[in-house]
Structures are given as structure tokens and as C-alpha cells.
């Protein structure tokens, strides 16, 4: 057992173009709230789908009111950290949905509205007991940052929090299926791994695989009460001491509510109170409906008129995912041909183009040589993107306009003489050396 | 299409209690605002309380703070309001309302309406 923290840290405009100043209006004071839905593995982050390892709303933050002309401020949070506890081990790898909403404080009589303001949502590896990890994520307009981190509950302890610490000074019994605790204070020793499908409640092993049940439950798995027609009670094994019957399994064991849901026996099954934004027998439905605005970035929300009914998002172009929360780069794809640059401007893809080559994706190679002249009789040659001059001896340069000194890079070898001519250069070989440049 | 039914009304004495329900069919009450509305003879129809019920966020009016409480039952699929320390001008048709994009107490936001159930407070 232990519980999953979530700090935020702060919520506002993105960086770049056309974020929005605040989620507030002049007109229409405001306030922000938060809540998040955690599942266990790197499940599919659908809305839908039930929070199985819990959800937790923040309070409200402070009333926000945008003052015409001023700089945009950091929006006022509520206080405190969203707190999910999670009974069983922690899973490791878990997807988030964090949800901002907005309450607009309307008129006294007209009361406030609610809206889905933006909804952001991952796949994480988290070690319980670690530090806090940080995330900045985006939803179109708006950028979340948070921190979050999982702990666990004495006595567990360990990644998973399925390791049971008893320390020193405890009584040394551990309980049904925990080995004694190790002699160091705080140490201890996972527990066993019984028989498969040994009741938690009523059985326990001192070896591995096996089920040893408590007073008053048997069967392999320790599973079926062992009765007795003495008491009135209608269920449950007797009791060693009494003779009477104490509570057996019941329709709650366990507790078949999902996410935080509170059981409750009728007579002839259960009920499960949900906690507020689920629903259905077990509480395993989250409901999000079109009405709550799941559709980002200008996303066209079908179905979904009621919590039953699944809504789809139709996104814009440029964007994808189940809400239309993921920008799609578009330019992961190469789409600029010939070495050009890809510019993302959101509402369309432009290509910079290296030189020499044109059009929409850089896909026209240019004639670099059109309307460029190589002067002092140079030859221009295409290629690259970009033209270059063959220079006639004596000239150099871009365009052969540079008057060259052929003898500058020392061409004669062996202490020959260089001696510039019109028609490039002549070597004056020293005593013992010949060939145009007195290589031999 | 969802189906409100309202029940629970009566006639009470001033200072009595009453609770009424509000069962949706047809579809989950999960996840939208709800609300309480009330209309006495030849008044407007005046927002009491609402509730988001994805969320457990309540709003009340001043004349029933207090007094009156908005709270939800998914298992049931009910939207309730327990009215207490009731007054002879609590008297009126009491209506409960759902799904609406606009403030929650205001009337002409609600897209669907039940039939509505009595109150009647007597001196």
C-alpha cells in the first residue's frame, strides 16, 4: 500500500504564437481545479477507460480575474498536493491523465459553469520511494508543469511497496504469511509466495506454494468457511472460543468498487457508492462526455451525448490522439526534398530551401549556371545547389575575376625557380632535376 | 435521452424536512451538471442548487444556503436535495434539470427537464 502524490507546479500558456492569455475573462472571473486518473502498465491513456489505481480531485484555487492590458500572470493554483492512494503493489509502469478544469463564477444567481479546459496525459516508469520526478506536458495552447512521485505506507517498503518491514523493536511473530522481520531495524523479508489463489484473508504459508488456513476456514485454498449449525448467523465459521459463527466471506470481500468506490451488502448482492466522476456497477466507468469539451486544439467531438456512449474526436489536421491532444510532426516525415529545411508553422509545413533548388518541397533542381557568367574566359559549372566557375590559367576566384598568381603555391619542386606566364607557369629546375615541375 | 422523474414532494409543516429525488433513466447521471429549480405560482422559475456529478462540485442560492443540500447516488442513478428548516416561501413546484454548457442555475442552459414534484409549506 501507498500513495501516489502529484504537486503542480503551474499552469499556462505555452510558449509561441496564439496561446491564449488566460482561461479567464475580464468579463468572467474564474477559477482552476485539477484532477487525475491513474491506471496501472502503459495501458492506453483513453479517458474512458476506469482510473483501476484511482483518481483525485484538487480543492479550487484562487479566483482569478484577467485585467485588460496587464501582463499575464502565473495563474493562482489550488494549494496542497492531489493525493491517490493505491491499496495494492505499486505497479511500476502506470499511465496519468491530469485534467485542468475551469469553474467560471458567473452572477450570484446564475452560479458557476464547469468546463474541461485542457487534458494532458502519459506512460510513465516510476520506482516507489523515490524523488520527486518533474514533467512539463502540453495540450494545444496550454502547458502543464507538475511533479509527482509514489511512496509507501508502513509497513511496506521497497519499488513496488510489497515489501513488509516490522521494525526490531516490534513483536518478533510477523503475521500469516510474512517471514520474521530481518534483525536490523527497518529490514525486512518479502513475504512468501503461497499457493496460488490462497485467500489473502484466511490463509497464509510458512513454505513456498503452500495454503495453510486460519481457525475456521478450510478447503485447498482456504476459501470455504467451515460451518457449523449452532448459531443463527446465516454464514461464516464458528469460532473456537465462542462455538459461534464469526463473520465469513460476504458479497464486499475485497472490495469489488473500483476506484475508491465504498461497498455496502444487500440482500441478495452488493452496492457500490462511487466517488464523484464514476459510475457503473463496480465504479469502473470514468464519464467524460461531449459535453465536457474533450476535443482539443479545434477537434470536432461526435457521439458521446451520455456517459454510455463513447465520443470520437475528429482531429484538425496537424493534429492527432484520442482528444486531439498530440501535435503530429509533420516533419518527421522529410517532406523538404534536396536537403531543405523543414519549417512546422502549425497551420502549414514550409521548406527552406538550400540554394540551387526551389519549389514547395525544395523538389526543383535550379539551373545554377542560368544567368551567371564566368568572366576571363571560365566555364561554369553546374552541381550542389550551387554553381562554380572552371577558371582559365591565371584567374581564380568565385567568378575568375581574381587575378591568380600561379607561383604562389610554390609548384617547382627541388629549388626550381617558378616564373609566371600568360599561359600558366614554368619551372627552372636547379642542377640534377627535370619535368615540369623538376619532380624528377 | 435522458428521462428525469421527480418525487418526494409533500406538504410540511414551517421548520419540517423533506427529501427530494431526482432518478434519471435512459442514461447515467455520471459526469454533467445537474440542478434544482424551483417555481412558485406566478414567479419566475429560480435556480436552488446544482451539482457537477463528475466532479461533486455543489452551488447553492443564498435564500438556501444552509438549509438545503444538493449530493448525488451513482449506484441509483439520483440527483437528491435534502431540504431542511423549510419556510412557507419555500413553497413551489420543485423541478431537477440536466446537461448544460452554461452557469449552472441558469434555466434556459438545461437541455433536459423533469415534470416536477410539489412542496407545499404551511405556518
Known amino acids: 500500500a501507498g500513495v501516489f502524490e502529484l504537486q503542480i507546479h503551474s499552469f499556462g500558456p505555452g510558449p509561441g504564437p496564439g496561446a491564449p492569455r488566460s482561461p479567464c475573462s475580464a468579463r468572467l472571473p474564474c477559477r482552476l481545479f485539477f484532477r487525475v486518473c491513474l491506471k496501472p502498465g502503459l495501458s492506453e491513456e483513453a479517458a474512458e477507460s476506469p482510473c483501476a489505481l484511482g483518481a483525485a480531485l484538487s480543492a479550487r484555487g484562487p479566483v482569478y480575474t484577467e485585467q485588460p492590458g496587464a501582463p499575464a500572470p502565473d495563474l493562482p493554483l489550488p494549494d496542497g498536493l492531489l493525493q491517490v492512494p493505491f491499496r495494492d503493489a505499486w505497479p511500476g509502469t502506470f499511465s496519468f491523465i491530469i485534467e485542468t478544469w475551469r469553474e467560471e463564477l458567473g452572477d450570484q444567481i446564475g452560479g458557476p459553469a464547469w468546463s474541461l479546459l485542457a487534458r494532458v496525459a502519459g506512460r510513465r516508469r516510476l520506482a516507489a520511494g523515490g524523488p520527486w520526478a518533474r514533467d512539463i506536458q502540453r495540450a494545444g495552447a496550454w502547458e502543464l508543469r507538475f511533479s509527482y512521485r509514489a511512496r509507501c505506507e508502513p509497513p511496506a517498503v521497497g519499488t513496488a511497496c510489497t515489501r513488509l518491514c516490522r521494525p526490531r523493536s516490534a513483536p518478533s511473530r510477523c503475521g500469516p504469511g510474512l517471514r520474521p522481520c530481518a534483525p536490523l531495524e527497518d529490514e525486512c523479508e518479502a513475504p512468501l509466495v503461497c499457493r496460488a489463489g490462497c485467500s489473502p484473508e484466511h490463509g497464509f504459508c510458512e513454505q513456498p506454494g503452500e495454503c495453510r488456513c486460519l481457525e475456521g476456514w478450510t478447503g485447498p485454498l482456504c476459501t470455504v468457511p467451515v460451518s457449523t449449525s449452532s448459531c443463527l448467523s446465516p454464514r461464516g465459521p464458528s469460532s473456537a472460543t465462542t462455538g459461534c459463527l464469526v463473520p465469513g466471506p460476504g458479497p464486499c470481500d475485497g472490495n469489488p468498487c473500483a476506484n475508491g468506490g465504498s461497498c455496502s451488502e444487500t440482500p441478495r448482492s452488493f452496492e457500490c457508492t462511487c466517488p464523484r466522476g464514476f459510475y457503473g456497477l463496480r465504479c469502473e466507468v470514468s464519464g467524460v462526455t461531449c459535453a465536457d469539451g474533450p476535443c482539443f486544439n479545434g477537434g470536432l467531438c461526435v457521439g458521446g451525448a451520455d456517459p454510455d456512449s463513447a465520443y470520437i474526436c475528429h482531429c484538425p489536421p496537424g493534429f492527432q490522439g484520442s482528444n486531439c491532444e498530440k501535435r503530429v510532426d509533420r516533419c518527421s516525415l522529410q517532406p523538404c526534398r534536396n536537403g531543405g529545411l523543414c519549417l512546422d508553422l502549425g497551420h502549414a509545413l514550409r521548406c527552406r530551401c538550400r540554394a540551387g533548388f526551389a519549389g514547395p518541397r525544395c523538389e526543383h533542381d535550379l539551373d545554377d549556371c542560368a544567368g551567371r557568367a564566368c568572366a576571363n574566359g571560365g566555364t561554369c559549372v553546374e552541381g550542389g545547389g550551387a554553381h562554380r566557375c572552371s577558371c582559365a590559367l591565371g584567374f581564380g576566384g568565385r567568378d575568375c575575376r581574381e587575378r591568380a598568381d600561379p607561383c604562389a603555391a610554390r609548384p617547382c619542386a627541388h629549388g626550381g625557380r617558378c616564373y609566371a606566364h600568360f599561359s600558366g607557369l614554368v619551372c627552372a629546375c636547379a642542377p640534377g632535376y627535370m619535368g615540369a615541375r623538376c619532380e624528377f | 435521452q435522458v428521462k428525469l422523474v421527480e418525487s418526494g414532494g409533500g406538504s410540511v409543516q414551517a421548520g419540517g424536512s423533506l427529501r427530494l429525488s431526482c432518478a434519471a433513466s435512459?442514461?447515467?447521471?455520471?459526469?454533467?451538471?445537474m440542478a434544482w429549480f424551483r417555481q412558485a405560482p406566478g414567479k419566475e422559475r429560480e435556480g436552488v442548487a446544482c451539482i457537477h456529478t463528475g466532479l461533486g462540485r455543489t452551488y447553492y442560492a443564498d435564500s438556501v444556503k444552509g438549509r438545503f443540500t444538493i449530493s448525488q447516488d451513482n449506484a441509483k442513478n439520483t440527483v437528491y436535495l435534502q431540504v431542511n428548516s423549510l419556510k412557507p416561501e419555500d413553497t413551489a413546484m420543485y423541478y431537477c434539470?440536466?446537461?448544460?454548457?452554461?452557469?449552472?442555475?441558469?434555466?434556459?442552459?438545461?437541455?433536459?427537464w423533469g415534470q416536477g414534484t410539489q412542496v407545499t409549506v404551511s405556518s
Open positions: 435512459g442514461s447515467t447521471i455520471s459526469s454533467r451538471p
Open positions: 434539470a440536466a446537461d448544460s454548457r452554461r452557469p449552472c442555475m441558469v434555466a434556459a442552459g438545461y437541455t433536459y
